[in-house]
């Protein structure tokens, strides 16, 4: 299927001009390659009429141009002084030959309709109303006024001043006069349909002295607006129907042969195919509303219509707006998993794509809610604090410049299952939908923190350990302190070279975090997680409460009250064949003030975990295992 898109049918009248826009995929090659407009002959040959290389055929000389708009990925063909000879089949396309990528366009040029010389032409859109002005001479002021519609043989009454109304115009036609002006009457017809188009005659009086006026009413279907969108991207249908329908229910439907199937309306109807990826914005006082659809699929391509009616369904004679949506399969939006699976108590890390050209845009994550017109309240964002009910378990990690940001949600429950949107305040095409499925956990989590009920004592040393399985051995481990502005990764200090491990003991892989000395600001949520480069993996969370020292408890008395242990990542995996008696010592980390310590230790973790890490008088914290960690202040 060609990725070039344009209007399928273009119609005009002799002497007028047309402007034809063709869309092409957003690539550097496409922006610079030759654009052409050619006419298809009976033999299947397509004869170039105009191209972006400067070629202009004789028959287009002085009346056509082709303009490329690389910033929009479109080119436009303008043709003036149309004649009926211009009716035919054309192609707009890209490439060095006319056999390149193209789109078929049918152009129809009609004759100017012949109308009586004094005819007044009114051109209105379907669903709108028209007010026809009917002048008359003063002597006909007392006479009957009427409007009739010409049929083949006669003129069928629409309405007259004796309050006679044609049944098909009841409730739609009104005859009236304004103020004291006795030389003109008006007929207003509302909710116009195609059937209302035609020739009308206004009349005041009877016989030869009657005043008559010819009126031509043209009722037009709105020209569909072309929308060219990438697969997996997002589209917004901006619908502006006018104040007169501001209080009516609104809908968006998709044409299906003769009918238009409602996709969504403001009365709560929604097509299941669009579950989790559609929203209708609140209506405003001017009758404007918009429908947002994310995660575009091939099958979403088609002809869409928005409208307003109390039923929330398409109704003849009500205003509409139309679009032709093309879904380009050569998408710039990366193909990511649209379903992410998690388990209760576990976590998910969701990679959200954004337009790499907009790395400074603000990133957001919202949860789609289908009730009413649908909502997507933002749960977290670059500058948007985490919503209160997600405290301690949700964070957004922006990785500037690489076209991806990550949202991590942990402590999952089945309530978290649903649809979520990734979006920015920039290019709205890059909105994507993720479905989160949460199953009941059937085994222990991969990451486990001990102690689980964490209460640290002010001024003392406190260590928490995060146990991870061997499969995470090669991944980077981290601790971060959560706040409603994000999860700040605690700096780690790699202690010495890693040793190769003969085997990996499932029970002994851990990364520890030590708070030394504990302060009131240390209270809060901490996450232990794994990542590989910029790709985040699993996390687990723990809340550390800080309480005052109770009388009689031991305490650390550092020489410098402000001194705090640095986060040190001591990664030592011990060969399981080495006996505990060998006491492999970890190098002294040295004095680091006001910081945190992370330790990542090997197979004597059990003993480290069991130890109380009581502080000695000089402020050193020691583990009671055969490994000694000296933290000098």
């Amino acid at each position: 299927k060609s990725p070039i898109f344009g209007p399928q049918e273009v119609s005009s009248i002799e002497g007028d001009s047309v402007s034809i826009t063709c869309y092409y995929p957003d690539t550097s090659v496409n922006r610079h390659t030759r654009k052409y407009w050619c006419r298809q002959g009976a033999s299947g040959m397509c004869t170039t009429l105009i191209s972006s290389n400067g070629y202009l055929s004789k028959e287009y000389s002085g009346r056509a141009n082709l303009i490329n708009f690389p910033e929009n990925n479109t080119f436009v063909i303008n043709i003036e002084q149309l004649t009926q000879d211009d009716t035919g089949s054309y192609k707009c396309g890209l490439g060095t030959s006319n056999r390149g990528l193209s789109f078929d366009v049918s152009l129809e040029v009609s004759q100017v309709p012949e109308l009586p010389s004094d005819t007044h032409v009114y051109t209105k859109d379907i669903g709108r109303n028209v007010t026809i002005e009917c002048p008359f001479k003063r002597e006909n002021a007392p006479s009957k006024k009427s409007l009739c519609k010409k049929t083949n043989q006669s003129c069928e009454l629409v309405i007259d001043s004796t309050e006679k109304v044609n049944p098909s115009y009841i409730g739609r036609a009104k005859l009236f006069m304004k103020g004291t002006d006795l030389t003109v009457f008006y007929v207003n017809i509302s909710h116009l349909t195609h059937n209302d188009a035609g020739l009308y005659i206004c009349q005041a009086g009877e016989g030869p002295s009657a005043d008559k006026k010819n009126v031509d009413l043209q009722v037009l279907a709105p020209e569909p607006e072309l929308l060219y969108k990438d697969l997996r991207s997002s589209v917004t249908f901006e619908c502006d129907l006018g104040r007169e329908v501001a209080n009516e229910a609104k809908y968006l439907c998709r044409m299906n042969k003769e009918t238009c199937d409602v996709i969504i309306n403001t009365l709560g109807k929604r097509d299941p195919d669009f579950e989790g990826r559609i929203l209708i914005t609140p209506k405003d006082d001017n009758g404007r509303f918009s429908v947002l659809i994310t995660g575009l699929r091939k099958e979403d391509a088609g002809h869409y219509q928005c409208g307003a009616h109390s039923s929330g369904l398409p109704q003849e004679g009500w205003p509409i707006q139309t679009w032709q949506l093309f879904v380009n399969e050569e998408s710039t939006i990366p193909n990511r998993r649209s379903v992410v699976k998690g388990v209760t108590g576990g976590s998910v890390a969701i990679a959200c794509p954004y337009n790499p050209k907009e790395s400074s845009s603000l990133k957001y994550w919202c949860r789609w809610e289908g009730d009413g017109n649908g909502h997507c309240p933002v749960l977290v964002g670059t500058q948007a604090q985490v919503q209160e009910e997600y405290e301690g378990r949700l964070a957004l990690f922006d990785q500037p410049g690489n076209g991806t940001y990550t949202v991590i949600l942990n402590q999952l429950t089945t309530e978290d299952a649903g649809f979520y949107w990734c979006l920015t305040n920039g290019d709205s095409r890059w909105r994507t939908t993720i479905e989160l499925q949460v199953a009941e956990a059937t085994r222990e989590p991969n990451l486990e923190v001990t102690p689980q009920n964490a209460t640290a004592v002010l001024g003392e040393t406190f260590t928490v350990s995060c146990h991870y399985p061997c499969k995470f051995y090669s991944q980077e481990k981290y601790w971060c302190k959560w706040s409603n502005k994000g999860c700040h990764i605690l700096p780690s200090h790699d202690e010495g070279a890693r040793q190769s491990s003969v085997s990996c003991d499932q029970s002994s892989q851990l990364v520890s975090m030590t708070l030394n000395p504990v302060s009131k600001e240390d209270e809060g949520w901490y996450w232990c997680g794994v990542k590989q480069g910029q790709t985040y993996g699993e996390t687990t969370a723990i809340y550390i409460a800080v309480e005052e020292r109770t009388r009689g408890s031991s305490h650390v008395n550092p020489t410098d009250a402000n001194a705090r242990a640095k986060v040190a990542l001591e990664e030592e995996v011990v060969d399981s064949s080495i006996s505990e008696k060998e006491n492999k010592a970890i190098p002294n980390p040295g004095p680091f003030a006001n910081e945190r310590e992370i330790q990542n230790v090997g197979d004597q973790a059990q003993e480290n975990r069991a130890s109380g890490d009581a502080g000695s008088a000089d402020g050193q914290s020691r583990s009671s295992s055969s490994k000694h960690h000296h933290h000098h202040h």
């Epitope: 909502h375 948007a384 909105r431």
Partner: nanobody, 131 residues
Framework: EVQLVESGGGLVQAGGSLRLSCAAS????????MGWFRQAPGKEREFVAA????????DYADSVKGRFTISRDNAKNTVYLQMDSLKPEDTAVYYC????????????????????????WGQGTQVTVSS
Amino acid sequence: EVQLVESGGGLVQAGGSLRLSCAASGRTFDSYAMGWFRQAPGKEREFVAAISWTGGSTDYADSVKGRFTISRDNAKNTVYLQMDSLKPEDTAVYYCAAEVVGRDVTTMYRVSGLEYEYDYWGQGTQVTVSS
């Protein structure tokens, strides 16, 4: 409830520039669409500029288009109005206003130039442009 405090007003010569700031109190600044209005002596209060809660959408009165720029910093709970090429007719008290829209995708681009749609107002800051 949000409190709005404008600052940055003052006396400036025609052709000069000023930058107004509006600091908002409260945790939920990013659930408000913000606007600037002004009132010249003896005249009605009129719309100047508005910005959506994300900052992704802005709107301006015709009289200031191309000269004034509205922006916001949600991390600092502040909205700004950069006023360049000032004219004597820009002299007025400038008010900052907040409309509760909620942090929702459906309101991401919502901006309003209608006074009655705003829920909170600042006290105003005087801007005087001399010729």
